[in-house]
Amino acid sequence: APISSHCRLDKSNFQQPYITNRTFMLAKEASLADNNTDVRLIGEKLFHGVSMSERCYLMKQVLNFTLEEVLFPQSDRFQPYMQEVVPFLARLSNRLSTCHIEGDDLHIQRNVQKLKDTVKKLGESGEIKAIGELDLLFMSLRNACI
């Protein structure tokens, strides 16, 4: 079972209209540049076999990957949204730094790895897709962690 007290974000993190709006606008702008609409990164497959109490830990992994492998490398694009959204998401990541799972998390790592592989396989268009799904990442993170 996860150490659930650490796998939590305060509701107030998601009750800031300005940054919420900027996150959704960034996602919308990137999704317009996404020509691969058949693939969805944040969907049922990502959460397959993951219990309610493990969802936040999974989303922490997805958030960290998105920041390190997608947003930082693409930080010069989709301005001015990117320069505001990235620090916000980085703060959420920092607040989840003590979120861990005791015991086996292989099923979670397997699901996250499939998402990583899909992004890597698609190359730059995979990174654009991940940015285009920041609205889903924001909402999924909220739903899993509050």
Epitope: A1, K11, F14, I42, G43, E44, F47, H48, G49, V50, S51, M52, S53, R55, L136, M139, S140, R142, N143, A144, I146
Partner: antibody
Framework: EVQLVESGGGLVQPGGSLRLSCAVS????????MIWVRQAPGKGLEWIGI???????YYASWAKGRFTISRDNSKNTVYLQMNSLRAEDTAVYYC?????????????WGQGTLVTVSS | AVVLTQSPSSLSASVGDRVTITCQAS??????LAWYQQKPGKAPKLLIY???TLASGVPSRFSGSGSGTDFTLTISSLQPEDFATYYC??????????????FGGGTKVEIK
């Protein structure tokens, strides 16, 4: 093909008990949370409770104490145990698969089983 | 617990009509809203989730919109098989789990 089939409904006297079953096929039950929802005749849908992958259960406040959800993954079956039944529990009872996609969505649903509480 | 108010509770329409059903939440539910269709004597069927994402196999004449507290289900051109009752359903996280899932009262779409 994914299928959910409820059974165990019928006529029961007030104060009586009933156990409903939801047999699933076409997917691995152990990978999904499952919910129970009921619908009184001519009325809307009412959530009863949910059983998570790890067996944790959560109930609507009105259902706590009288209703119990359990699962047997080896039998591909989810159960709803109902005790101290009242006339107002008369309804069609549905089970549904909970697909979490970042938000919980219920899909698909079983065909339902009718429970009538009457003397 | 969040309360979902659907309007109208019933409506009469003809084949080919554009139909709009609204669902109002008593508190901010972001985009945590789904729509279900239920035909008489049948189980509910998922139509839309994330307020606007069409479920697999659902015809494109169905669409959803909204966020926060106000949501809309639109059928662009009503077909004979669309006469049914429609329910909105919200997921509310972060509160007590005993009120996580809530359904609206339903909107019955009848033949004019």
């Amino acid at each position: 093909e994914v299928q959910l089939v409820e059974s165990g409904g019928g006529l029961v006297q007030p104060g009586g008990s009933l156990r409903l079953s939801c047999a699933v096929s076409g997917f691995s039950l152990s990978s999904y949370a499952m919910i129970w929802v009921r619908q009184a005749p001519g009325k809307g849908l009412e959530w009863i409770g949910i059983i998570d992958i790890d067996g944790s259960t959560y109930y609507a406040s009105w259902a706590k104490g009288r209703f119990t959800i359990s699962r047997d993954n080896s039998k591909n079956t989810v159960y709803l145990q109902m005790n101290s039944l009242r006339a107002e529990d008369t309804a069609v009872y549905y089970c549904a698969r909970d697909r979490f996609v970042g938000v919980d969505i219920f899909d698909p649903w079983g065909q339902g089983t009718l429970v009538t509480v009457s003397s | 617990a969040v309360v979902l108010t659907q309007s109208p509770s019933s409506l009469s329409a003809s084949v080919g009509d554009r139909v709009t059903i609204t669902c109002q939440a008593s508190e901010d539910i972001y985009t945590n809203l789904a729509w279900y269709q239920q035909k008489p004597g049948k189980a509910p069927k998922l139509l839309i989730y994330w307020a606007s994402t069409l479920a697999s196999g659902v015809p494109s004449r169905f669409s959803g919109s909204g966020s926060g507290t106000d949501f809309t289900l639109t059928i662009s051109s009503l077909q004979p098989e669309d006469f049914a009752t429609y329910y909105c359903q919200a997921c509310v996280y972060g509160n007590s789990a005993d009120s996580r899932y809530t359904f609206g009262g339903g909107t019955k779409v009848e033949i004019k």
